[in-house]
């Protein structure tokens, strides 16, 4: 399910429960995706020892995964709500091709991988409603994404395992960073 439990119509209709605010819905959605990533990481970490390797040992890769930096306005120092929101949405849009790559990369967690992908699409929609400056958000080029996907899928098994691990770790960190920032907004 792309939306966490407690979000469906019958649940919202419960008389004792206040409907979630936009911020609460976004917060819950991110936590739901992070839980999904956690389950996927369990499978990848059980298959290889990459999770124990230091970041430096895995840093040499050609992946251009989105990453938060000081200039993005999402950190405590130099916090800027509007700049940060644009970065979060742009970053999530850039992650979509990598989430597509993750499909078919899992044996026992195939549905979980799909749920993470679909939930991220829903999260982007929630955030786009919150953003005022939608013009500043650049959407990745579909042709570039298609060729990147082809290239990633053509890698040997070891590199594919490494890529899977790096995507999950980077996406987790990006979402955690986004959550910290959104909770300050």
């Amino acid at each position: 399910a792309p939306v966490p439990p407690g979000e469906d119509s019958k649940d919202v209709a419960a008389p004792h429960r206040q409907p979630l605010t936009s911020s609460e819905r976004i917060d819950k959605q991110i936590r739901y995706i992070l839980d999904g990533i956690s389950a996927l990481r369990k499978e990848t970490c059980n298959k290889s020892n990459m999770c124990e390797s230091s970041k430096e040992a895995l840093a040499e890769n050609n992946l251009n995964l989105p990453k938060m930096a000081e200039k993005d306005g999402c950190f405590q120092s130099g916090f800027n709500e509007e700049t940060c929101l644009v970065k979060i949405i742009t970053g999530l849009l850039e992650f979509e091709v990598y989430l597509e790559y993750l499909q078919n990369r899992f044996e026992s967690s195939e549905e979980q991988a799909r749920a993470v992908q679909m939930s991220t699409k829903v999260l982007i929609q929630f955030l786009q409603k919150k953003a005022k400056n939608l013009d500043a958000i650049t959407t990745p080029d579909p042709t570039t994404n298609a060729s990147l996907l082809t290239k990633l899928q053509a890698q040997n098994q070891w590199l594919q395992d490494m890529t899977t691990h790096l995507i999950l770790r980077s996406f987790k960190e990006f979402l955690q960073s986004s959550l910290r920032a959104l909770r300050q907004m």
Epitope: S38, E52, S54, K55, A69, Q76, E173, S177, R180
Partner: antibody
Framework: EVQLVESGGGLVQPGGSLRLSCAAS????????MTWVRQAPGKGLEWVGM???????AYANSAIGRFTISRDNSKNTLYLQMNSLRAEDTAVYYC??????????????WGQGTLVTVSS | DIQMTQSPSTLSASVGDRVTITCQAS??????LSWYQQKPGKAPKLLIY???TLASGVPSRFSGSGSGTEFTLTISSLQPDDFATYYC????????????FGGGTKVEIK
């Protein structure tokens, strides 16, 4: 053995500076979020600051502008640079490892602490 | 900013007693709360996280409950080793705060 060992504490004059170190062993520091917590003599625990994955940091109000957390992944060591020290900064300083697996901060591995005394 | 208020600050109890410590957050923190035990001259030890999940190696006499702003740590039957100071800690947001920890509760022998 998985452990954290703090060092660098001591006596320093008000207005002075000090750099604390926290050496990690048995795990790679770069894979975890790390925090500093302090405890004044006879008082409770006080969170000081945190360093996240992409060198993002967060600080308690009392530490903003005076304290800086950094790490050297090649040395597997965490640092706390403390400037403009005041008498109220006197405390045992602990470094701790955050679980990092989820979104909420929780500290599941602690060092033994190092005492910082700010006095003239 | 989020403030954590713990009560009582001191609690006198006997071995075998059921002990309850409460922690209140100034705003909702979901279930993002941890409990720690600290003995004199020692570093704190994580007991419970996510409000109710027992940390590895922690005896089952310890339990946690609560969500939103009200949380409880319960020791079902106090043991000699449990006389210590207990702290709650919010993990929801570490920005613009004075402290993530509650003021502490000292559990002493009656």
């Amino acid at each position: 053995e998985v452990q954290l060992v703090e060092s660098g504490g001591g006596l320093v004059q008000p207005g002075g500076s000090l750099r604390l170190s926290c050496a990690a062993s048995g795990f790679s520091l770069s894979n975890y979020y790390m925090t500093w917590v302090r405890q004044a003599p006879g008082k409770g625990l006080e969170w000081v600051g945190m360093i996240y994955g992409s060198d993002e940091t967060a600080y308690a109000n009392s530490a903003i502008g005076r304290f800086t957390i950094s790490r050297d992944n090649s040395k597997n060591t965490l640092y706390l640079q403390m400037n403009s020290l005041r008498a109220e900064d006197t405390a045992v300083y602990y470094c701790a490892r955050d679980d990092s697996s989820d979104w909420d901060a929780k500290f599941n591995l602690w060092g033994q602490g190092t005492l910082v005394t700010v006095s003239s | 900013d989020i403030q954590m208020t713990q009560s009582p600050s001191t609690l006198s109890a006997s071995v075998g007693d059921r002990v309850t410590i409460t922690c209140q957050a100034s705003q909702s923190i979901n279930n993002e709360l941890s409990w720690y035990q600290q003995k004199p001259g020692k570093a704190p030890k994580l007991l419970i996280y996510r409000a109710s999940t027992l940390a590895s190696g922690v005896p089952s006499r310890f339990s946690g409950s609560g969500s939103g702003t009200e949380f409880t740590l319960t020791i079902s039957s106090l043991q000699p080793d449990d006389f210590a100071t207990y702290y709650c800690q919010q993990g929801y947001s570490l920005r613009n705060i004075d402290n993530a920890f509650g003021g502490g509760t000292k559990v002493e022998i009656k």
